[in-house]
C-alpha cells in the first residue's frame, strides 16, 4: 500500500479488511465502508450492477447470485473493493451464455465460480465430445475461463465450464462459441 501524505485524499476502508470473502449460502453478508466522504457501494457481477447509498451493505440471506465485486467509492472518486463468494453447492457457476470470439483473439467464457476452493476449473466438450487439442485457457474464478487465441475451427464449438466437487465432475450450462473471421 502506498503511504498517503497528510491532506492527500485516501481510499475508503472496508470491513472486513480482506480482498476476498467466502460466505455460505443463507448466511449474512455485512460490509462496512468507513470514509467521511462516503458516496456509494457498487456491486458488479457479469453484466449486473447495483448501487447502495448506505455505508453498510447488508444482505441478510446470501444467495449464489450475491457473488461478485463490492466497491466502495468516496467523494474524491477513490475506491476500494472486496470480492464476495457465496458458496452454494447447488449453484457452482454464475453464467452469461453469450460467447463470441474473433479469430486469433482471446475470448472469455463467462462462468465465474461461487466457490473458489473447488478444483479442476476447466472446459469440457458437450456430450463427452473431445475439445480441440490445441485449445488453451487461463482460468479466473472471478470472471470465467479465457480461451486463448481463438481458431476459426472452433466456430460452433459446444462446451461447458467444469469443476470437481467432492470427486465428481460438475458442469455449467452449455456455451456455443461463435467465431468471427479475422478478415
Amino acid at each position: 500500500q502506498p503511504s498517503v501524505s497528510p491532506g492527500e485524499p485516501s481510499p475508503p476502508s472496508i470491513h472486513p479488511g480482506k480482498s476476498d470473502l467466502i460466505v455460505r449460502v443463507g448466511d449474512e453478508i455485512r460490509l462496512l465502508c468507513t470514509d467521511p466522504g462516503f458516496v456509494k457501494w457498487t456491486f458488479e457481477i457479469l453484466d449486473e450492477t447495483n448501487e447502495n447509498k448506505q455505508n453498510e451493505w447488508i444482505t441478510e440471506k446470501a444467495e449464489a447470485t450475491n457473488t461478485g465485486k463490492y466497491t466502495c467509492t468516496n467523494k474524491h472518486g477513490l475506491s476500494n473493493s472486496i470480492y464476495v463468494f457465496v458458496r452454494d453447492p447447488a449453484k457452482l457457476f454464475l453464467v452469461d451464455r453469450s460467447l463470441y470470439g474473433k479469430e486469433d483473439n482471446d475470448t472469455l467464457v463467462r462462468c465465474p465460480l461461487t466457490d473458489p476452493e473447488v478444483t479442476n476449473y476447466s472446459l469440457k466438450g458437450c456430450q463427452g465430445k473431445p475439445l480441440p487439442k490445441d485449445l488453451r485457457f487461463i482460468p479466473d474464478p472471478k470472471a470465467g475461463i479465457m480461451i486463448k487465441s481463438v481458431k476459426r475451427a472452433y466456430h460452433r464449438l459446444c462446451l461447458h465450464c467444469s469443476v470437481d466437487q467432492e470427486g465428481k465432475s460438475v458442469l455449467s450450462e452449455k456455451f456455443i462459441l461463435k467465431v468471427r473471421p479475422a478478415f
Partner: nanobody, 125 residues
Framework: EVQLVESGGGLVRAGGSLRLSCAAS????????RAWFRQAPGKEREFVAA????????YYPNSMKGRFTISRDNAKNTVYLQMNSLKPEDTAVYYC??????????????????WGQGTLVTVSS
C-alpha cells in the same frame, strides 16, 4: 524464456512427507500454468497437480487428491508440492512444468513447453 529449478526431493520412509519446490526465473510473468508431473522408471510421465499463477485455481487427478497439495508463493515466484502419506509407489523423478496457458487437456505432459531437470523422490518401505 522461463527457467525452472526443482528442489526438495530425497529419501523418505513410507507414511512420511516431503515438500517439493519449483523456483521460476526469466520471463515468468507471462506463464500462468504451472504443473507437477512425475516419471517412475520404465513408466510414462504422469500428471500430479497444477496451479494457475494468476487465479490460484488448482488441478489434480482423482488418484492424487487428498494426499498431495499444490500451492504458490507469488513473491518468491515458487510453486510447492506438499506430499503426505507417501507410498513406495510414489517413488519417481518429479518434474515442474510451465506454459503461458493451460492446454484443454491439462494432464497431457506433451502440451507443456517448459520443464525443469527434475528432483528424485524415493519412498522406502
Amino acid at each position: 524464456e522461463v527457467q525452472l529449478v526443482e528442489s526438495g526431493g530425497g529419501l523418505v520412509r513410507a507414511g512420511g512427507s516431503l515438500r517439493l519446490s519449483c523456483a521460476a526465473s526469466g520471463r515468468t510473468f507471462t506463464y500462468d500454468a504451472r504443473a507437477w508431473f512425475r516419471q517412475a522408471p520404465g513408466k510414462e510421465r504422469e500428471f500430479v497437480a497444477a496451479i494457475s499463477w494468476s487465479g490460484g485455481s488448482t488441478y489434480y487427478p482423482n488418484s492424487m487428491k487428498g494426499r498431495f497439495t499444490i500451492s504458490r508463493d507469488n513473491a518468491k515466484n515458487t510453486v510447492y508440492l506438499q506430499m503426505n502419506s507417501l507410498k513406495p509407489e510414489d517413488t519417481a523423478v518429479y518434474y515442474c512444468a510451465a506454459d503461458e496457458s493451460f492446454p484443454a487437456y491439462y494432464s497431457d505432459y506433451a502440451l507443456y513447453r517448459y520443464w525443469g531437470q527434475g528432483t528424485l523422490v524415493t519412498v522406502s518401505s
